[in-house]
């Protein structure tokens, strides 16, 4: 799985979209590592 910053950002965007944005406030690209996925 791709762990670059850009991959992490796009994966998180997809996760936020699927969850309707209902996630923790600190669940942002610079706070989460690839292990979050």
């Amino acid at each position: 799985s791709c762990n670059t910053a850009t991959c992490v950002t796009h994966r998180l965007a997809g996760l936020l979209s699927r969850s309707g944005g209902v996630v923790k406030d600190n669940f942002v690209p610079t706070n989460v590592g690839s292990e979050a996925f």
Partner: antibody, heavy 119, light 107 residues
Framework: EVQLVQSGAEVKKPGASVKVSCKAS????????MNWVRQAPGQRLEWIGD????????NYNQKFKGRATLTVDKSASTAYMELSSLRSEDTAVYYC????????????WGQGTTVTVSS | DIQMTQSPSSLSASVGDRVTITCKAS??????VAWFQQKPGKSPKALIY???YRYSGVPSRFSGSGSGTDFTLTISSLQPEDFATYYC?????????FGGGTKVEIK
């Protein structure tokens, strides 16, 4: 409105250093990585590196390792790219860019800063 | 470093034409490819991410496809504002790398 506003054009002599700034607004600066990319005249885009403004972690293109330094000033929502030991081949337009999710999912780029290295 | 080879380097087309630009990676990059449009004297503008997803506001005539090593950007019906240079980028591995660009000119 998300904006990345870069500092103005610079003219430097070979061997000198240049520091380009990128002021971010319209989003939470520390939430998203900042990339730096350059483009020499008539050439392809070239990635310099990225920085995590939250923990100041960096990734560099090995081509620039040791010459490029990426930093941030969180309080000013500003990212910096310093390039040392300048040579004529470093003449290029330097861009900052960041993929933002909130408020709008998009890859935003600064307007570019022209750096000219000439004796 | 992963090399991104774009073809053609330039092409001439007319308004309304279907235009296809290809990008080949020197190794597998999954679908971690973006496409950008750049006009003279301007910053690059992002069009596509993850090989096939359009950013919001990008016209539907732009589409991307591919995975692994072979990628395509298609403009289904070229418009006057589409004459520009297009770049692919892989972000699967550091350092991120860009293709050499494809200049789309008016025939």
């Amino acid at each position: 409105e998300v904006q990345l506003v870069q500092s103005g054009a610079e003219v430097k002599k070979p061997g000198a250093s240049v520091k380009v700034s990128c002021k971010a607004s319209g989003y939470t600066f520390t939430d998203y990585y900042m990339n730096w990319v350059r483009q020499a005249p008539g050439q392809r885009l070239e990635w310099i590196g990225d920085i995590n403004p939250n923990n100041v972690g960096t990734n560099y293109n090995q081509k620039f390792k040791g010459r490029a330094t990426l930093t941030v000033d969180k309080s000013a929502s500003t990212a910096y790219m310093e390039l040392s030991s300048l040579r004529s081949e470093d003449t290029a337009v330097y861009y900052c860019a960041s993929i933002i999710i909130v408020p709008n999912y998009f890859d935003y780029w600064g307007q570019g800063t022209t750096v000219t290295v000439s004796s | 470093d992963i090399q991104m080879t774009q073809s053609p380097s330039s092409l001439s087309a007319s308004v309304g034409d279907r235009v296809t630009i290809t990008c080949k990676a020197s190794q597998n990059v999954d679908t971690n490819v973006a496409w950008f449009q750049q006009k003279p004297g301007k910053s690059p503008k992002a069009l596509i991410y993850s090989a096939s997803y359009r950013y919001s506001g990008v016209p539907s005539r732009f589409s991307g496809s591919g995975s692994g090593t072979d990628f395509t950007l298609t403009i289904s019906s070229l418009q006057p504002e589409d004459f520009a240079t297009y770049y692919c980028q892989q972000y699967n591995n550091y350092p991120y790398t860009f293709g050499g660009g494809t200049k789309v000119e008016i025939k």
